[in-house]
Amino acid sequence: QPEQKTLSLPGTYRHVDRTTGQVLTCDKCPAGTYVSEHCTNMSLRVCSSCPAGTFTRHENGIERCHDCSQPCPWPMIERLPCAALTDRECICPPGMYQSNGTCAPHTVCPVGWGVRKKGTENEDVRCKQCARGTFSDVPSSVMKCKAHTDCLGQNLEVVKPGTKETDNVCGMRLFFSSTNPPSSGTVTFSHPEHMESHDVPSSTYEPQGMNSTDSNSTASVRTKVPSGIEEGTVPDNTSSTSGKEGTNRTLPNPPQVTHQQAPHHRHILKLLPSSMEATGEKSSTAIKAPKRGHPRQNAHKHFDINEH
């Protein structure tokens, strides 16, 4: 045996000289090498570099380096290569997570849903319904719900209130002198005060990343249509400043689109599990009426999924 189980000083190991039977204390070899010749009464131990395909992580007294793990099976990629100092380490590529020994695509949160928790190489994305005052108009595995454009803050009118799937549509304000109220034929864009924002069902899917709270979704590419979840499309806020009861329904598993969306880095937010997220502040420059307010890319440094 190259190493005895007896105590030895740090940085040394015990070796029994096979010819004399004498127990010798030898210096260990550094990480990335192994003991090609043990020490004797007359000589120091000899270290050699680990051959290709093998490694040692720590200083040691072993006579042979450890074999590296097998090459990463598709679609995994190497996080660390097999080298003298490190074993090969495989991880799922960006946009995928490890599930049952293989890689599955991150759930894509559907329109009307945003990312509540971003995915990692070991955990799927968690989706949530966009809450009052927020929306998501593209399927994405990285974007949070974004706040509706603040039309009033830009001195514009809400021509069409946003929903959880669409932004507010802003238009030029119509100014009338106090002495000349608008005639009955003039169109002014009023803001209904009590429209249920998500009460008009449309699609009924739930993204996979919304399974039980403490569950990690295990799935391969999913495109499933969960049961019983309505994706309402009624206005979520009457105006930026006076919103209606928007909904932030959190579908347990919004449908997933299996393709990955380019990170649009738009913000979303969640409050109670769903609506308190994201802080995307945005502004849209609508000059002509009507114009859809485009949230500007958040100036937030991190594109934390939960953020954008």
């Epitope: 928790k117 319904q129 709270t213 979840i229 309505e230 959190t250 937010l269 409050l271 939960n306």
Partner: antibody, heavy 115, light 110 residues
């Protein structure tokens, strides 16, 4: 008009159980995430639990995890909170709230845990 | 101890401007929207501000919200006696994976 009406509160001994209900009306209940938030006497608001519109995902505060269970019956427009192994520190007014933004709240129901 | 820090109290005379702060961290306010709730004595909380600075219909424009970095604030201009209440800020916390509330601020109209 959106209305949330909690019920089921009362006096219970430590270790006991209680089931709170929240009857919703005035909106499409099945479209909304719902939550329970509590307020101990003279204290601030504390989020307790939330459930997605279909019931597929639930979230719990660490202080109640493993003891409380949130559920909903969309056919009855009702939200529930099953509270087991109750402790004195669970004494509070329990509110149900609508949407992730908690845009509407019920009037609350008082739960007193005392021997 | 709350993840969001609010001053326990604030006060002002009628007509004055009062500001309530809410301090958090990158994992909550810094990365998520802020909500404010008003709780009048003996009543349930009511949503006052959502997504940092938006008011639900029916909320007077005397109330305004703002957010900067990891802090948020609620301003009440033209303070009125009916504004005497407890005010709470709230947001989502990415690290806790849960919503969090501030400890609340009691506003007194002198």
């Amino acid at each position: 008009e959106v209305q949330l009406l909690e019920s089921g509160g009362g006096l219970v001994q430590p270790g006991g159980s209680l089931r709170l209900s929240c009857a919703a009306s005035g909106f499409t209940f099945s479209n909304y995430e719902m939550s329970w938030v509590r307020q101990a006497p003279g204290k601030g608001l504390e989020w307790v639990s939330s459930i997605y519109s279909s019931g597929g995902e639930t979230l719990y505060a660490d202080s109640v995890k493993g003891r409380f269970t949130i559920s909903r019956d969309n056919s009855k427009n009702t939200l529930y909170l099953q509270m087991n192994s109750l402790r004195a520190e669970d004494t509070a007014v329990y509110y149900c709230a609508r949407d992730g933004a908690a845009d509407y709240w019920g009037q609350g129901t008082l739960v007193t845990v005392s021997s | 101890q709350s993840e969001l820090t609010q001053p326990p109290s604030a006060s002002g005379t009628p007509g004055q401007w009062v500001t309530i702060s809410c301090s958090g961290s990158t994992s909550n306010i810094g990365n998520n929207y802020v909500y404010w709730y008003q709780q009048l004595p003996g009543t349930a909380p009511k949503l006052l501000i959502y997504t940092n600075n938006q008011r639900p219909s029916g909320v007077p424009d005397r109330f305004s919200g703002s957010k900067s970095g990891t802090s948020a604030s609620l301003a009440i201009s033209g303070l009125r006696s009916e504004d005497e209440a407890d005010y709470y800020c709230a947001t989502w916390d990415d690290s806790l994976y849960a919503p969090v509330f501030g400890g609340g601020t009691k506003v007194t109209v002198l």
